[in-house]
Each structure stands twice: as C-alpha cells, then as structure tokens.
C-alpha cells in the first residue's frame, strides 16, 4: 500500500531573469527511492537516478542545474517557463508519487512572494499519476534524501 | 500519433547476425525508453533488453548477454537491435515497444511496434 | 519456467466476470508494485491494460480492473464481450532486476 506523502514549494512565483528552486519531499514511507523525474508539462528536464546520478535534458542544458538535494535550479527565467512542473518519485516497492508545482515568472519586482514560498515546503499530500511518468529500471542503491551526483 | 515503425521480415542461416529497426514517431524519442520484446511461434513474451536514449543506458536480459547489441540513433529517431550467432530457437517476432513514462528502461509498455518476423533455417 | 505463474486457460460466458491469477514465484517479482498486463489476439501486437498493478491507460474499457494480494496480482474483466478472447500475459518490472512476463493465459468467450 502506498503510505507516502509528496511535500513541494507549491505555487511559486519569480522574476523574468531570475532563477528559482523547485523542491519535492517525499515522507511517510520507507520505499526506496530509485529515480526522481523533473517534468515541465509535456517535457522532461531533467533526471536523478539512484546508479547515475543526474541527468538534464539537452536542450534545458544551459539553464536547468540540479539541486539542491533532489530539487531543480531553473535559471535565466522567462515568461515562457510559467506553468506547471512535476516532480516524479519512482519507488520500490510503492510505485510512483507525483507532486505538482505551479510557478508564475513575472515581467517585475511582483514577484515577491517566491522567496517566502522557498523557505516553507507547502504540504502537497499524496498524488499517484497515471499518465506519462516513468520508474527506471535498474535503481539498486536507493536516493539519499539530499540527493545529488552519485 | 505516437507510433513504431518496425523493419520487414528477415530470412536468416544458423550462425549469422541479424539486425531489426524501430523508427518512432509523434513524441520525443530521447526522452523514454525502447525495449524489445520477442515470441517464437505459438509460445509467450520474452524481453530481451532495452535502451534509455535519454542515459545511454543499455539493459540486456541476462539469457541473451553476449548475443545481443541494442543501440540507438537519437537523430533518426531509430532504435536497433543485433542478435548474433543464430539459432532455429531464435525464430520469433521481434517487437520493439515504448516504456509508458519517460526516463528509463524496464516499465510497462504503452506502444508497440507491429513486429518483425525473424525466420532462422538452414 | 517463468517467475510468474498465471492458469494456462480461463474461460467464461458473455456478461460474466473472470479472474486470470499472477503469482510471483520469486523475491525479484514478489509483493512490489510493478506489475502489469497485457491483451494479444492472434497476430497481433500485445496491448497495455493494466500498469503499476490497478491503474488503466486512457482508452481501455473500465471493465479491465487489476488488484494485488501479496505476492498475486489478479486482472478481471467484467460483462465479459465476444472481443475479449484473446491471450493475457502478466508483467512484473521491479527496479534492478529484468523485465518478466508469465507465461500467458488464454481466455476463452463461450457461446
């Protein structure tokens, strides 16, 4: 049974030109975490996987850095990057939890709750998406919680 | 629409090599994994390995390591698989298949190539 | 011999409900959540019903339900149709070990 429940910063809002950090915990379970996937709508961004460590996609190279831990630095921020992006936690033996973050990227100084939003994880609760999201195959060692290259 | 496109049939000797293609279409093929999955006549699945272009990770069943290559061109969308040193058991159809999320090798399996007869006789 | 063991055949009438069994015979494929089934018709390529032991891909008749008990994972299919005479294999996928199927069970529609 899947005790699990996914914590995230929530809805974030930030600057155009500046970075944010998206962070997901993962609590209430003793499943091992084998990949953690970062997906913007129908894009995947980036990738920690508990035998290779971490992985960014191609073409978010240049402004997508991982971490801290197992959240996602987005950098160089445009107005293009508001919506949503998921966090995905591929576990053993649970299966798969999603949480959801929803960031605004603003033209000015608006944005001046996304840093309060940074300090507070905002309490997500338990989600199992059915769509698109994928386990690796091949996790043995587990992610620590602080994650990073491995 | 997301499909796999699969290379025809193939006619082979005991001992030869023989290599099947899957040319995906409709999404971001990096991004999620391929695997192959065989059935000889009459008999069940059998999955043979993968690959997560995504990593350049390959995952090969341990019954056919050694035997079997799989590999892919991210900039024709193409997966391969190579079997050598053939065998009249290996007379099946080949299919490769899609993982259903992205970002690995291994999962269940939402799109499927229409397979590839692959005939072994001397 | 596959790690997963399903009955060789079922069968039943139109509008009945049948259950095909999965039980894994191994610790790799044991009480995980990774599990999955599939239909084939003659000829035809394997199509996903059930992933992750109970969820349903969109477009799959919500007559298709899975259910894991322990070590047994369990596909049942309701107001069973002519159409549903096919082959149904099962699949367990845990991280760090290879994907298996069992060795597939063939439903037979009677009537």
């Known amino acids: 049974m899947m005790t699990g429940t996914i914590e995230t910063t929530g809805n974030i809002s930030a600057e155009k030109g500046g970075s944010i950090i998206l962070q997901c915990h993962l609590s209430s379970t003793t499943a091992q975490v084998t990949q953690v996937n970062w997906e913007q709508q129908d894009q995947l961004l980036a990738i920690c996987n508990a035998d290779l460590g971490w992985h960014i996609s191609p073409s978010f190279k240049d402004r997508v850095a991982p971490g801290p831990g197992l959240g996602l630095t987005l950098q160089s921020l445009t107005v293009n990057d508001t919506g949503e992006y998921f966090c995905i936690y591929h576990t053993y033996p649970d299966g798969t939890y999603t949480g959801r973050i929803f960031l605004e990227v603003l033209e000015s100084s608006v944005a001046e709750h996304g840093a309060r939003f940074q300090e507070n994880l905002y309490f997500q609760g338990l989600e199992h998406h059915h769509h698109h999201h994928h386990h690796h195959h091949g996790g043995s060692g587990g992610l620590p919680e602080t994650g990073g290259d491995r | 629409e997301v499909q796999l496109v699969q290379s025809g049939a193939e006619v082979k000797k005991p001992g030869s090599s023989v290599k099947v293609s899957c040319k995906a279409s409709?999404?971001?093929?990096?991004?999620?994994?391929i695997s192959w999955v065989r059935q000889a006549p009459g008999q069940g699945l059998e999955w043979m390995g993968g690959i997560t272009p995504f990593f350049n990770r390959v995952d090969v069943a341990e019954k056919f390591q050694g035997r079997v290559t799989i590999t892919a061109d991210k900039s024709t969308s193409t997966a391969y698989i190579e079997l050598s040193s053939l065998r009249s058991e290996d007379t099946a159809v080949y299919y490769c298949?899609?993982?259903?999320?992205?970002?690995?090798?291994?999962?269940?399996?939402?799109?499927w190539g229409r397979g590839t007869l692959v005939t072994v006789s001397s | 011999q596959s790690a997963l063991t399903q009955p060789r055949s079922v069968s039943g009438s139109p509008g009945q409900s049948v259950t095909i069994s999965c039980t894994g015979t191994?610790?790799?494929?044991?009480?995980?959540?990774?599990r999955s089934w599939y239909q084939q018709h003659p000829g035809k390529a394997p199509k996903l019903m059930i992933y992750e032991v109970s969820y349903r891909p969109s477009g799959v008749s919500n007559r298709f339900s899975g259910s894991k008990s322990g070590n047994t994972a369990s596909l049942t299919i309701s107001g069973l149709q002519a159409e549903d005479e096919a082959d149904y294999y099962c699949s367990s996928y845990p991280p760090s070990s290879a994907t298996v199927f069992g060795a597939g069970t063939k439903l037979t529609v009677l009537g």
């Open positions: 409709g999404y971001t093929f990096a991004s999620y994994g």
């Open positions: 298949a899609r993982d259903l999320r992205r970002g690995g090798v291994g999962d269940a399996f939402d799109i």
């Open positions: 191994s610790p790799d494929v044991g009480s995980h959540a990774y």
